[in-house]
C-alpha cells in the first residue's frame, strides 16, 4: 500500500491496533522490513507499507483526520470529499474525521444528503455499521451532539465555534463519498440546531447534547421539524433528568412559524403537545446550576408524525348541489389571544387542501375532513340568500328557513345560519311565521334556549335590529317592511338535540309601510315582555312599529310600561304612541316626547300598540319596554 498526503492538506492518517481480539497470531505493519503496530502519516509525507498477515481488518483500524481552520483564512465550504480516496486505502475499518475550527460569530452547517440521519442512543449500533459522530465546542470543552446512523430524518446540523464530524465506515463498506457538505451561516446564538425533515408518516428519537450525560449548563439547543401540513406531529419525552437549578428552571419552548402564540413554554414534566400541524421548533433551555450539587439535565424524546386520528380521518359529504345562493364557512372560533400552546386545527377539502378557514359554496357536493385535535375549536357560519325579483311571481310564496340536515351532521358546531331575505323595494313585504311561538329576549326575561333568531334589517344604510327571539313565547308572527336578515344563532352544543324546535316560514306579502308588526297571542301562564327594536341604540328616526296583541274572550290583558317617561327628545317631528282597541277602534294617543307613559291599563279585547319615532337628538333615544299579562275576567279588578 502507498499513502501520499499532499503538502498543506492538513490531513493526518493514523493506522493503529483496533480493539484487541483473541486471535492467536499477531499482525504488524511492515515498513522497510520494520514491524510496527502504529503508523502515523502527516501532510506532505508518502509512505509505502504492507501487513504481515492476511486479514489486517481483524487487527487494525485507520483514522483519517482533516483539520479545517476557518480562523486564519477562508473556509473550504461545499461538498466534503473523502481524502484520500477509499480505493487508495487498505481495507480496514476506517474513520474519517473532519475537525473544523471557527470563530464564535460564525455558524457552521452540516448538510446531509439523502439518506438523512437517525440519532441513536448509548449502546445502540447502526445496522450497516456506518456511524456519524458529531461534536461541537463551547470554548475549549467538547460537547457531543450525538451519534447517527443512515436512513433517518436529520438533514442539517448547525453549530458555531467549531464542529468535529467523524464518519465511521466498516472495512467491507463500499461507500466512497462523505454524504455531507459544510456551509457557513450567521451565528446561531446557541449550542446547535438540528433540522429533522419528515416526508410522510414516521418517527424520530432525538437526544440532548452529551446524552446520557448532562446537557451543558445554561445552554440552548433547538430542533427544527419540517412536517407536511396534512400530517400531525406529537412530542413525547421518553427519558429525562432534571438538574438542580438556582433560579430559572430548565424548560422546553415550542415555536410554530406563523403562530400568534409563540413561544409556548413547557416544563419537562408537563404533558408535551400533540397534534401539531405542519412545521415547528422545539428548544431545550438549561439553567444555572447549583454549584454544590448541580445534578444533570438530559432529555431523550420522540416525535411521532402521523395522519390525524379518530374523528379527523373521517370524510364528510356536504351536499349543496341543490342549494342556491348559499355559502358555508368553517372557521376557528375567536379566542382571546393567549400564549397558551395551540396545535394546528385545519379543515381539508378532498383531504388535500388544508387551511384554518374553508368556505363551501352552493351548487356542488363537497368532501371535507378535519385535521384537528379538538373540533370544538371550529364553528360553522352559513349564509343563504332568498330573493324575489318579480313581485308577481313571488307574492304569497313561502320558504322554510330550516338548517339542512347535512350541515347538522357535521362534527363542528353551527354558530350562525343567516338567511338574507330580499324583496323588490316598495312592492312586497315579508312575514315570518315560527313553528313554535317566539319569545323576545329581554333583560327581564332572557332566552335560555340553545338557539335564537336574530332579526335585523338587511338594508345597508339602515341600522335596525328587531331583536333576538327564541322558541317558547307568545309572538305568533313578525311582519317586516323590507329586506331583512334572519340569523339562527346557537348558544350550546345541545342545539343538535333541540334542532327539531327550529322552524320558521317566510312568505312574501303585499307591501305595507310600517317597519315591523309583531302579532302577539299571550298565554295565560306567563308575562310577555316586549321591547322596541334597536334596544340600547334607540328606535331609528321616523320609524314606526306595531304590536297586534290578541286577548282571548275570557281574559283581560294588563299592559304595563317599565318607566315613567320615554326619555326621547325630538330634534324634528313628534314621537307618539297609539293604543287602539281593535273591536271599538277607540284609541288613546300619547306624545312620547312630552307625556308621561300610561299607567298599567286593562284591555278586554285585542288591541294595537303603535309606536312612531321622531328625529331624536343624539343621546336621547326612544327605547321602550312593556309587558302584557293575561288574567281571567272573573277576577275583581277593582
Amino acid at each position: 500500500f502507498e499513502i501520499a498526503l499532499p503538502r498543506e492538506s492538513n490531513i493526518t492518517v493514523l493506522i493503529k491496533l483496533g480493539t484487541p481480539t483473541l486471535l492467536a497470531k499477531p499482525c504488524y505493519i511492515v515498513i522497510s522490513k520494520r514491524h510496527i503496530t502504529m503508523l502515523s502519516i502527516k501532510s506532505g509525507e508518502r509512505i509505502v507499507f504492507t501487513f504481515s498477515c492476511q486479514s489486517p481488518e481483524n487487527h487494525f483500524v485507520i483514522e483519517i483526520q482533516k483539520n479545517i481552520d476557518c480562523m486564519s483564512g477562508p473556509c473550504p465550504f461545499g461538498e466534503v470529499q473523502l481524502q484520500p480516496s477509499t480505493s487508495l486505502l487498505p481495507t480496514l475499518n476506517r474513520t474519517f474525521i473532519w475537525d473544523v475550527k471557527a470563530h464564535k460569530s460564525i455558524g457552521l452547517e452540516l448538510q446531509f444528503s439523502i439518506p438523512r440521519l437517525r440519532q441513536i442512543g448509548p449502546g445502540e449500533s447502526c445496522p450497516d455499521g456506518v456511524t456519524h459522530s458529531i461534536s461541537g465546542r463551547i470554548d475549549a470543552t467538547v460537547v457531543r451532539i450525538g451519534t447517527f446512523c443512515s436512513n433517518g430524518t436529520v438533514s442539517r446540523i448547525k453549530m458555531q465555534e467549531g464542529v468535529k464530524m467523524a464518519l465511521h465506515l466498516p472495512w467491507f463498506h463500499p461507500r466512497n463519498v462523505s454524504g455531507f457538505s459544510i456551509a457557513n451561516r450567521s451565528s446561531i446564538k446557541r449550542l446547535c440546531i438540528i433540522e429533522s425533515v419528515f416526508e410522510g408518516e414516521g418517527s424520530a428519537t432525538l437526544m440532548s447534547a452529551n446524552y446520557p450525560e448532562g446537557f451543558p449548563e445554561d445552554e440552548l439547543m433547538t430542533w427544527q421539524f419540517v412536517v407536511p401540513a396534512h400530517l400531525r406531529a406529537s412530542v413525547s419525552f421518553l427519558n429525562f433528568n432534571l438538574s438542580n437549578c438556582e433560579r430559572k428552571e430548565e424548560r422546553v419552548e415550542y415555536y410554530i412559524p406563523g403562530s400568534t402564540t409563540n413561544p409556548e413554554v413547557f416544563k419537562l414534566e408537563d404533558k408535551q403537545p400533540g397534534n401539531m400541524a405542519g412545521n415547528f421548533n422545539l428548544s431545550l433551555q438549561g439553567c444555572d446550576q447549583d454549584a454544590q450539587s448541580p445534578g444533570i439535565l438530559r432529555l431523550q424524546f420522540q416525535v411521532l408524525v402521523q395522519h390525524p386520528q379518530n374523528e379527523s380521518n373521517k370524510i364528510y359529504v356536504v351536499d349543496l348541489s341543490n342549494e342556491r345562493a348559499m355559502s358555508l364557512t368553517i372557521e376557528p372560533r375567536p379566542v382571546k389571544q393567549s400564549r397558551k400552546f395551540v396545535p394546528g386545527c385545519f379543515v381539508c377539502l378532498e383531504s388535500r387542501t388544508c387551511s384554518s378557514n374553508l368556505t363551501l359554496t352552493s351548487g356542488s357536493k363537497h368532501k371535507i375532513s378535519f385535521l384537528c385535535d379538538d373540533l370544538t375549536r371550529l364553528w360553522m357560519n352559513v349564509e343563504k340568500t332568498i330573493s324575489c325579483t318579480d313581485h308577481r311571481y313571488c307574492q304569497r310564496k313561502s320558504y322554510s328557513l330550516q338548517v339542512p340536515s347535512d350541515i347538522l351532521h357535521l362534527p363542528v358546531e353551527l354558530h350562525d345560519f343567516s338567511w338574507k331575505l330580499l324583496v323588490p323595494k316598495d312592492r312586497l313585504s315579508l312575514v315570518l311565521v315560527p313553528a313554535q311561538k317566539l319569545q323576545q329576549h329581554t333583560h327581564e326575561k332572557p332566552c335560555n334556549t340553545s338557539f335564537s333568531y336574530l332579526v335585523a334589517s338587511a338594508i345597508p344604510s339602515q341600522d335596525l335590529y328587531f331583536g333576538s327571539f327564541c322558541p317558547g313565547g307568545s309572538i305568533k308572527q313578525i311582519q317586516v317592511k323590507q329586506n331583512i336578515s334572519v340569523t339562527l344563532r346557537t348558544f350550546a352544543p345541545s342545539f343538535q338535540q333541540e334542532a327539531s324546535r327550529q322552524g320558521l316560514t317566510v312568505s312574501f306579502i303585499p307591501y305595507f309601510k310600517e317597519e315591523g308588526v309583531f302579532t302577539v297571542t299571550p298565554d295565560t301562564k306567563s308575562k310577555v315582555y316586549l321591547r322596541t327594536p334597536n334596544w340600547d341604540r334607540g328606535l331609528p328616526s321616523l320609524t314606526s312599529v306595531s304590536w297586534n296583541i290578541s286577548v282571548p274572550r275570557d281574559q283581560v290583558a294588563c299592559l304595563t310600561f317599565f318607566k315613567e317617561r320615554s326619555g326621547v327628545v325630538c330634534q324634528t317631528g313628534r314621537a307618539f304612541m297609539i293604543i287602539q282597541e281593535q273591536r271599538t277602534r277607540a284609541e288613546e294617543i300619547f306624545s312620547l316626547d312630552e307625556d308621561v307613559l300610561p299607567k298599567p291599563s286593562f284591555h278586554h279585547h285585542s288591541f294595537w300598540v303603535n309606536i312612531s319615532n321622531c328625529s331624536p337628538t343624539s343621546g336621547k333615544q326612544l327605547d321602550l319596554l312593556f309587558s302584557v299579562t293575561l288574567t281571567p275576567r272573573t277576577v275583581d279588578l277593582t
Partner: antibody, heavy 121, light 107 residues
C-alpha cells in the same frame, strides 16, 4: 385520597428549635416533592423551600437558609422541617404542600392542614 | 425574586355577581401561575394551575386567564361559599412567590 397530615400546634420559648412533621398518604410519597410555606399576619404567605426525594433536590428561599432545615423519612412517608433559633417573628402557621411533580417544578396540588407555631417566653 | 402584585386587596360582592381578581408579575412567568382559595381557619385549596386549567373537582364558575405578566381569576356567578382570601402563586422560577391576597366578602 391524597392527604398531608401535619403535627399539632407548638408553643416554644425564644432561642429554642422546633421540628414540624408532614405525613403523606394516598400516594407514592417519594414520587413527589414537598414545599413548606409560612403564613403570618405581617407578611401573608412566604415560600420557605422544597425537598424533592425523587431528584434529591433541596432548595431554600434566601430568607430561610439559616432558619429552616428540611428532611424526609422515606420509610414513614414523612417530611420534616426544623426551625432553629426561634424568635417571636417565627410565630406563624406553617403549611406543607405537595408539588404536582416529583422535581419541585410544579404547582402545589395538595396542602396540609397547617401547624401553628407560637414563640413566647 | 419575581414580585406578584395582586389586586384588589379586598372586594365586596353580592351573590350571583361576576368577580375578577388580577395578578401582575414583575416579569414574564410563562403562564406558570396557580390560584388558590383560603377560607377562614382553613388551609389553602388550589383552584387553577397553568394560568387557566381547572383543578379536578373545582366548580366551573371559576376560570383563569392571562399570559406573560398579567393574569386573572374570574368567578362567573358568586356563591356564598366562595367567600375567603384568594392568592396567586408563580411557579416559573425559584423562589416561589405569592400575591398579597384578595379578601372576598359577600355583601
Amino acid at each position: 385520597q391524597v392527604q398531608l397530615q401535619q403535627s399539632g400546634p407548638e408553643l416554644v420559648s425564644p432561642g429554642e428549635s422546633v421540628k414540624i412533621s408532614c405525613k403523606g398518604s394516598g400516594y407514592t410519597f417519594t414520587d413527589y416533592a414537598v414545599h413548606w410555606v409560612k403564613q403570618s399576619h405581617s407578611k401573608s404567605l412566604e415560600w420557605i423551600g422544597v425537598k424533592s426525594v425523587y431528584y434529591g433536590i433541596t432548595k431554600y428561599s434566601q430568607n430561610f437558609k439559616d432558619k429552616a432545615t428540611m428532611t424526609v423519612d422515606k420509610s414513614s412517608s414523612t417530611a420534616y422541617m426544623e426551625l432553629a433559633r426561634l424568635t417571636s417573628e417565627d410565630s406563624a402557621i406553617y403549611y406543607c404542600a405537595r408539588d404536582s411533580y416529583g422535581s419541585s417544578r410544579g404547582y402545589f396540588d395538595y396542602w396540609g392542614q397547617g401547624t401553628t407555631l407560637t414563640v413566647s417566653s | 425574586d419575581i414580585k406578584m402584585t395582586q389586586s384588589p386587596s379586598s372586594i365586596y360582592v353580592s351573590p350571583g355577581e361576576r368577580v375578577t381578581i388580577t395578578c401582575k408579575a414583575s416579569q414574564d412567568i410563562n403562564s406558570f401561575l396557580s390560584w388558590f382559595q383560603q377560607k377562614p381557619g382553613k388551609s389553602p385549596k388550589t383552584l387553577i394551575y397553568r394560568a387557566n386549567r381547572l383543578v379536578d373537582g373545582v366548580p366551573s364558575r371559576f376560570s383563569g386567564s392571562g399570559s406573560g405578566q398579567d393574569y386573572s381569576l374570574t368567578i362567573s356567578s358568586l356563591e356564598y361559599e366562595d367567600m375567603g382570601i384568594y392568592y396567586c402563586l408563580q411557579y416559573d422560577e425559584f423562589p416561589r412567590t405569592f400575591g398579597g391576597g384578595t379578601k372576598l366578602e359577600i355583601k
